[in-house]
Interface confidence: medium
């Protein structure tokens, strides 16, 4: 076996190495002793865009001429690891994720450009890149240190309909307020003009051409 403990037998995983606090160091120090370990590099931190999109590069040092590669993105939050997405591709071809996958990606040599979409604040976590060289034998496995993806939910934009309602309400309020103000002012003004008399509005004949329809009322005091 060219790579002790990292060879796949039939469908069963014949696996040989476990990972925890210091174990990453254990991997890096001891795997080379009994296996040409495949190193996987990925950025330490990535900030998702306001639209919930995060992109990072996963680069692996291929020990051989692999033709079939499988890339898996694992998310670790708290203590639990879950598979986010996975794609198998033939060297030189595009990565094909499932239709409903939140991941997309492109490959270029030993580099895979991964994009994860639809992220929310609750999706913040460590995203680990796992690369498997499936064919030809021997089978190789490499696991990156993980990329901490931070997702900050944008301030929610108010609904445009809601904004229109607010605008309409404010406009109506201002209109009625100005109407009321005008009425009050006018009544005060009238009271000042003739404190002891009453009066009527009389429609006078037009002074300008009929077509303009501008009727101007005059105040005629009645004794």
């Amino acid at each position: 076996m060219a790579c002790l403990g990292f060879q796949r037998h039939k469908a069963q995983l014949n696996l040989a190495t476990r990972t925890w606090p210091c174990t990453l160091l254990f991997f890096l120090l001891f795997i080379p002793v009994f296996c040409k370990a495949m190193h996987v590099a990925q950025p330490a931190v990535v900030l998702a865009s306001s639209r919930g999109i995060a992109s990072f590069v996963c680069e692996y040092a291929s020990p051989g001429k692999a033709t079939e590669v499988r890339v898996t993105v694992l998310r670790q939050a708290d203590s639990q690891v879950t598979e986010v997405c996975a794609a198998t591709y033939m060297m030189g071809n595009e990565l094909t994720f499932l239709d409903d996958s939140i991941c997309t990606g492109t490959s270029s040599g030993n580099q895979v450009n991964l994009t994860i979409q639809g992220l929310r604040a609750m999706d913040t976590g460590l995203y680990i890149c796992k690369v498997e060289l499936m064919y030809p034998p021997p089978y190789y496995l490499g696991i990156g240190n993980g990329t901490q993806i931070y997702v900050i939910d944008p301030e929610p934009c108010p609904d445009s309909d809601f904004l229109l309602w607010i605008l309409a309400a404010v406009s109506s309020g201002l209109f009625f307020y100005s109407f009321l103000l005008t009425a009050v002012s006018l009544s005060k003004m009238l009271k000042k003009r003739s404190p002891l008399t009453t009066g009527v509005y009389v429609k006078m004949p037009p002074t300008e051409p009929e077509c303009e329809k501008q009727f101007q009322p005059y105040f005629i005091p009645i004794n």
């Epitope: 696996l15 476990r18 606090p21 670790q76 203590s79």
Partner: antibody, heavy 124, light 107 residues
Framework: QMQLVQSGAEVKKPGASVKVSCKAS????????ISWVRQAPGQGLEWMGG????????NYAQKFQGRVTITADESTSTAYMELSSLRSEDTAVYYC?????????????????WGQGTMVTVSS | DIVMTQSPSTLSASVGDRVTITCRAS??????LAWYQQKPGKAPQLLIY???NLQSGVPSRFSGSGSVTEFSLTISSLLPEDFATYYC?????????FGQGTKVEIK
């Protein structure tokens, strides 16, 4: 709450191999590490190795390197521990235990859930 | 490998006693230490993780302290069900190693 159920007791002859299974139920099996710990009669606890099914990786204590193989079958949520070239001193109770650990940060809670144990007797 | 040494090996105590078990690591393990309780014929049960954190469901009479190489487990007031064997375990560096155990027996 996850539970770990192990296979029954085994009696083996020196030089033979034994394969003990550990089936998980009530939890996400592949997301956690499963370790194997043994305890010889009247003795203390000894860690043999462990596996993280979703990572597809495991490691072994140097003492057992080359004699132990730990595998996992995600489809049946079962972990296996195979010990070969058995000797009389391998007579022990073999436990599988769930570990909660963090790949990068070191947040970790040791072995929080254990199987009931499998007695393996090596005798000629 | 990191060697874990527990003391005492056996401890005789009475119900209601305050009991302390110590565990020493052969090199620094920071706070990566767990304590387990094991009763005859049963699997161990996690009591304390990361030196001083009480595992969910474990009574508050159990407490852990210490760091670097010196650690201790204290049972504030022994109950009849606390008579068992206690193990410490480091998980700072693989392989994970256990202490040889401390048997708490009835005086």
């Amino acid at each position: 709450q996850m539970q770990l159920v192990q296979s029954g007791a085994e009696v083996k002859k020196p030089g033979a191999s034994v394969k003990v299974s550990c089936k998980a139920s009530g939890g996400t099996f592949s997301s956690y590490a499963i370790s194997w710990v043994r305890q010889a009669p009247g003795q203390g606890l000894e860690w043999m190795g462990g596996i993280i099914p979703i990572f597809g990786t495991a490691n072994y204590a140097q003492k057992f390197q080359g004699r132990v193989t730990i595998t996992a079958d995600e489809s049946t949520s079962t972990a296996y521990m195979e010990l070969s070239s058995l000797r009389s001193e391998d007579t022990a109770v073999y436990y599988c235990a769930r570990e909660i650990g963090s790949y990068s940060s070191g947040w970790y809670r040791a072995f929080d859930i254990w199987g009931q144990g499998t007695m393996v007797t090596v005798s000629s | 490998d990191i060697v874990m040494t527990q003391s005492p090996s056996t401890l005789s105590a009475s119900v209601g006693d305050r009991v302390t078990i110590t565990c020493r690591a052969s090199q620094s393990i920071s706070s990566w230490l767990a304590w387990y309780q094991q009763k005859p014929g049963k699997a161990p049960q996690l009591l304390i993780y990361k030196a001083s954190n009480l595992q969910s469901g474990v009574p508050s009479r159990f407490s852990g302290s210490g760091s670097v190489t010196e650690f201790s487990l204290t049972i504030s007031s022994l109950l009849p069900e606390d008579f068992a064997t206690y193990y410490c375990q480091q998980y700072s560096r693989p392989p994970w190693t256990f202490g040889q155990g401390t048997k708490v027996e009835i005086k």
